[in-house]
Amino acid sequence: FQTFEGDLKWHHHNITYWIQNYSEDLPRAVIDDAFARAFALWSAVTPLTFTRVYSRDADIVIQFGVAEHGDGYPFDGKDGLLAHAFPPGPGIQGDAHFDDDELWSLGKGVVVPTRFGNADGAACHFPFIFEGRSYSACTTDGRSDGLPWCSTTANYDTDDRFGFCPSERLYTQDGNADGKPCQFPFIFQGQSYSACTTDGRSDGYRWCATTANYDRDKLFGFCPTRADSTVMGGNSAGELCVFPFTFLGKEYSTCTSEGRGDGRLWCATTSNFDSDKKWGFCPDQGYSLFLVAAHEFGHALGLDHSSVPEALMYPMYRFTEGPPLHKDDVNGIRHLYGPRPEPEPRPPTTT
C-alpha cells in the first residue's frame, strides 16, 4: 500500500458524505446503496463511521459529471478514466467525482428494475433465455400488448420469473397525470404523436400525453428511461433500440452482433436498418459503481494506489464478486486510522 505524502488523513472519525447528483444509469436507490456499501467496506476495518448528509459542507462530496465538470481534471468520455478523488482536506479535497459518460451498473450489465410480473420487483437478468433464444434487452416477444418485459433469472424457460420493464405504456413519471401510461396516438399542437417526444421542451426530456388530446386536456407525464436499450456510439447515440428491426431482410427482436467482426452487440434505432441505416451499440456490462466508489473512497480517505494487482487500490478496474478488500488495502487504511475497536465486553445479565 501507499499513502499520500505526509500521511494525509481525516482528523476526525465521523466522516460525512453528500450525494450531490445522480447518474441516470441506475435507480437512485441503487446508487445510494452502492455508495453506502462502499463506505461500509472501510468502516468495517477502521474506527471510521460514514453518515449521509444533505449539504455541501460534507467532508466527502460525491458528484457525477462529464468532461469539464468544475475542477482542473476534466473527464475523458467513455472508458479510460472512470472517476477521480481528491485526498483528505477542506473544500474540494476529499471529494469523489464519477464520469457520467461511463455506463454505471453493478458490473454485470444495466440494472433495470421491474414492476409487476411475479418477481417482486427484482432487476432484469441480462442476457436471459426465452424460448431458446438469448435476449440482452427487454423484449415484447411473447406478448400481444406491446409491453416490454424481461426475465429476472438467466433462463425464463426453466424458472418462469419475469417482470415488466420501465415503459411509457405501463406508467409515466412526474408530470401531472398521477403516473398514468401514455396514450398513443395523442395530439400536441395539432399534430399526432405515436411515441414519446421531446417537442415543446428545451431540456431534452421525453414526454407524452396521457389522454388522446394534450391540447385539450393538458395531461402529461415523462417517459421512463430505458437503460437496457439506450444505445451508445454508432450514429444514434442516446436513442432507443427499436424492436423488432429489419437488417439484411431479416427481423431481429433483440440486440445482435450480426454483420460485425468484433462480436459487439448493436441494434437499429428505427424499425428498418436497411432503409434508414440508423444504429448504435447496445449497453455493455458497465462498470460496477460499488467497486469504483470503494476505490475512490480509499483515495478520499488518504490511500494512494497499491502495487498489489489483487488490491482494491490497484489502479486498474477489475470486476469481482468476491470480497473487494485485500489484506494490503486493510493494512493501508489501518496505517492511517488504526483498527476497528473491539466492542466493550458486557457484564452478564440476570433475569
Epitope: 475542477d71 482542473g72 472508458d79 472517476a83 477521480h84 478523488a85
Partner: antibody, heavy 124, light 107 residues
Framework: EVQLLESGGGLVQPGGSLRLSCAAS???????DMWWVRQAPGKGLEWVS?????????FYADSVKGRFTISRDNSKNTLYLQMNSLRAEDTAVYYC?????????????????WGQGTLVTVSS | EIVLTQSPATLSLSPGERATLSCRAS??????LAWYQQKPGQAPRLLIY???YRATGIPARFSGSGSGTDFTLTISSLEPEDFAVYYC?????????FGQGTRLEIK
C-alpha cells in the same frame, strides 16, 4: 532517474508542419498524464496540450485547437506533438512535462519533471 | 479561464534577505497551485505543489502558503542560485493557467 528528451524542433515556414517527440525514461510512462508547454522568446509559460495516461483523451489550448495533435506510444515511452498550419506566433521553446498526478489520483497539482525543450521557429 | 496575477513583476534583493512573492487568482482555486523556478536557458523546475508542499529535493528555505485566491512563495534567506524567474500555475479549474512571472534579481 527520470528523463524527458525532446526532439524535432527547427525552422519552418508559415503554414508548414513539424512533429515533436519526447522520449521518456526512469518512470512508468503509461501511468502518467503528459503535457506540452511552450514559451515564446522572452515570454511566460503557456500550456499547449495534455494527453491522459490511457492515451485516448486529449485536450488543447484554444490557440492550437484544430492545428496540433498530441499522441503517445506507451510501448515506446514516447510523447508526440504533430503541429500543422504553423504560424509565426507558434515560435517558442516547446517543453514536454510529466504530471505529478496520474489516473484517478488527483489533487497533487504540478509538473514534476520537464524536458530541456526544443526550439520551433516559424518564419519565412 | 482563471487569471493568475503575480506581484511584484520584479523583485530586487540581496543574498541572505527574505523574498516574498505573491500570486493572486481571479477566483478560488482551493489549494491547487504550484510554483516553479526557471533560470535562463533552462526548463522550469517544480518547487512547491498544492500551495504548500515542497517538491522532492527542494531546500527547506523555500515555502509556500495560501489557499483560495491568495498565495505566497517565501524564500527565507536568499542564496546566489535563487535569482531567477518564478511562475505560479493553477489547476483549480480548467484550463490550467500560469502567472506572468516574477523576476527575482540581485540588488
Amino acid at each position: 532517474e527520470v528523463q524527458l528528451l525532446e526532439s524535432g524542433g527547427g525552422l519552418v515556414q508559415p503554414g508548414g508542419s513539424l512533429r515533436l517527440s519526447c522520449a521518456a525514461s526512469g518512470f512508468t510512462f503509461s501511468w502518467y498524464d503528459m503535457w506540452w508547454v511552450r514559451q515564446a522568446p522572452g515570454k511566460g509559460l503557456e500550456w499547449v496540450s495534455v494527453i491522459y495516461s490511457s492515451g485516448g483523451p486529449t485536450f488543447y489550448a484554444d490557440s492550437v485547437k484544430g492545428r496540433f495533435t498530441i499522441s503517445r506510444d506507451n510501448s515506446k515511452n514516447t510523447l508526440y506533438l504533430q503541429m500543422n498550419s504553423l504560424r509565426a506566433e507558434d515560435t517558442a521553446v516547446y517543453y514536454c512535462a510529466k504530471d505529478r498526478a496520474y489516473g484517478d489520483y488527483v489533487g497533487w497539482n504540478g509538473f514534476d519533471y520537464w524536458g530541456q525543450g526544443t526550439l520551433v521557429t516559424v518564419s519565412s | 479561464e482563471i487569471v493568475l496575477t503575480q506581484s511584484p513583476a520584479t523583485l530586487s534583493l540581496s543574498p541572505g534577505e527574505r523574498a516574498t512573492l505573491s500570486c493572486r487568482a481571479s477566483q478560488s482555486i482551493s489549494s491547487f497551485l504550484a510554483w516553479y523556478q526557471q533560470k535562463p536557458g533552462q526548463a522550469p523546475r517544480l518547487l512547491i505543489y498544492d500551495a504548500s508542499y515542497r517538491a522532492t529535493g527542494i531546500p527547506a528555505r523555500f515555502s509556500g502558503s495560501g489557499s483560495g485566491t491568495d498565495f505566497t512563495l517565501t524564500i527565507s534567506s536568499l542564496e546566489p542560485e535563487d535569482f531567477a524567474v518564478y511562475y505560479c500555475q493553477q489547476r483549480g479549474n480548467w484550463p490550467i493557467t500560469f502567472g506572468q512571472g516574477t523576476r527575482l534579481e540581485i540588488k
